[in-house]
């Protein structure tokens, strides 16, 4: 049977707004990812800010609301905006546990979704780890 | 097919540790919550709580705070669940479960002194 | 913590009759996200529990449909359209909407 949708939660310093009421925080240890359950929907988020091929999370957590995407079984960033010049931030959300602790590939940032990514790459079979 | 095999009944003096073992086979282990169970001797169930084995996070029954550690062995597809400072009201058959569908055959530990 | 009561806590049925065993929570069991994590499951004797429901109405794989789910909110049913001699046991409901997860106290369902 399913359980409530668990996502790993992190906001990174001077984030501006927080999703942190849209689930409840689980009590982790240090060593390991904070982890929230959903409390609205059964979605989680990514976003991700790159630049100069350098990938940092920005926001891990809950969507508020079960939208498309959210049927993902993995974290697919897409590419969202530029907040400036050189740097793009990805997002992703995705339907299953903790999908959204990491990526397998970032797309470039100026084609959405297109194959041959020169974004940072995680060799066939691996997936990139975001260290919290 | 999917199967969970505990491992075999303990006797434990009140104070001591005892540590459950639950080997998992017939599915990917790090994509399934595993949970424990326990049952007294003839009384009810009682959720201790639950372990994600792709990361160890783990959500307890407040009760058993302090008191339970829950881990996986990921390479050998294995949860264990230890229980420390026994009292003779831990008495009970310990079960683990995939995610709540298929379950192990339970653990008999028994508290005595 | 949330208190789930079951009734009857026993219930005595002749072979191809139908049951029913009610569920009642002490709190809603619809969480956030619209779903109601609200489990049945039947253990029978020298056993380790079996799940037969979940989401309230979804049978699992391999349950007989003789086993059925209903229900919302805090007050849920497992009907059972005739009962056979392999459905002895004590049925459990179970909630997973809050934490600490919680089972009912169970119904044994013995053959008049």
């Known amino acids: 049977p399913p359980n409530r949708r668990t996502c790993v939660f992190f906001e990174a310093p001077g984030v501006q707004g927080s999703t942190k009421t849209l689930g409840e925080l689980l009590d982790t240890g240090p060593e390991l990812p904070r982890a929230i359950r959903c409390l609205y929907s059964r979605c989680c988020f990514g976003i991700w800010n790159l630049t100069q091929d350098r990938a940092q999370v920005e926001m891990q957590g809950c969507r508020d609301s079960d939208e498309p995407g959210c049927e993902s079984l993995h974290c697919d960033p897409s590419p969202r905006a530029h907040p400036s010049p050189g740097s793009t931030l990805f997002t992703c959300s995705c339907g299953t546990d903790f999908c959204n602790a990491n990526y397998s590939h970032l797309p470039p940032p100026g084609s959405p979704g297109t194959p041959g990514s020169q974004g940072p790459q995680a060799a066939p079979g691996e997936s990139i780890w975001m260290a919290l | 097919q999917v199967q969970l095999v505990q491992s075999g009944a303990e006797v434990k003096k009140p104070g001591a540790s005892v540590k459950v073992s639950c080997k998992a086979s017939g599915y990917t282990f790090t994509d399934y919550w595993v949970s424990w169970v326990r049952q007294a001797p003839g009384q009810g169930l009682e959720w201790m709580g639950e372990?994600?084995?792709?990361?160890?996070?783990?959500n307890f029954n407040e009760k058993f705070k302090g008191r339970v550690t829950m881990t996986t062995d990921t390479s050998t597809s294995t949860a264990y669940m230890e229980l420390r400072s026994l009292r003779s009201d831990d008495t009970a058959v310990y079960y683990c479960?995939?995610?709540?569908?298929?379950w192990g055959q339970g653990t008999l530990v028994t508290v005595s002194s | 913590d949330v208190v789930m009561t079951q009734s009857p806590l026993s219930l005595p049925v002749t072979l191809g009759q139908p049951a029913s065993i009610s569920c009642r929570s002490s709190q809603s069991l619809e969480y956030g996200d619209r779903y109601t994590y609200l489990e049945w499951y039947l253990q029978r004797p020298g056993q380790s529990p079996r799940l037969l429901i979940y989401?309230?109405?979804n049978r699992f794989s391999g349950v007989p449909d003789r086993f059925s789910g209903s229900g919302s909110g805090t007050d849920f049913t497992l009907k059972i359209s005739r009962v056979e001699a392999e459905d002895v046991g004590v049925y459990y409901c179970?909630?997973?909407?809050?934490?600490?997860?919680?089972f009912g106290q169970g119904t044994k369902l013995e053959i008049k």
């Open positions: 479960a995939r995610q709540r569908d298929y």
């Open positions: 372990i994600y084995p792709k990361n160890q996070v783990s």
């Open positions: 989401g309230v109405s």
């Open positions: 179970f909630q997973a909407t809050h934490d600490p997860n919680t």
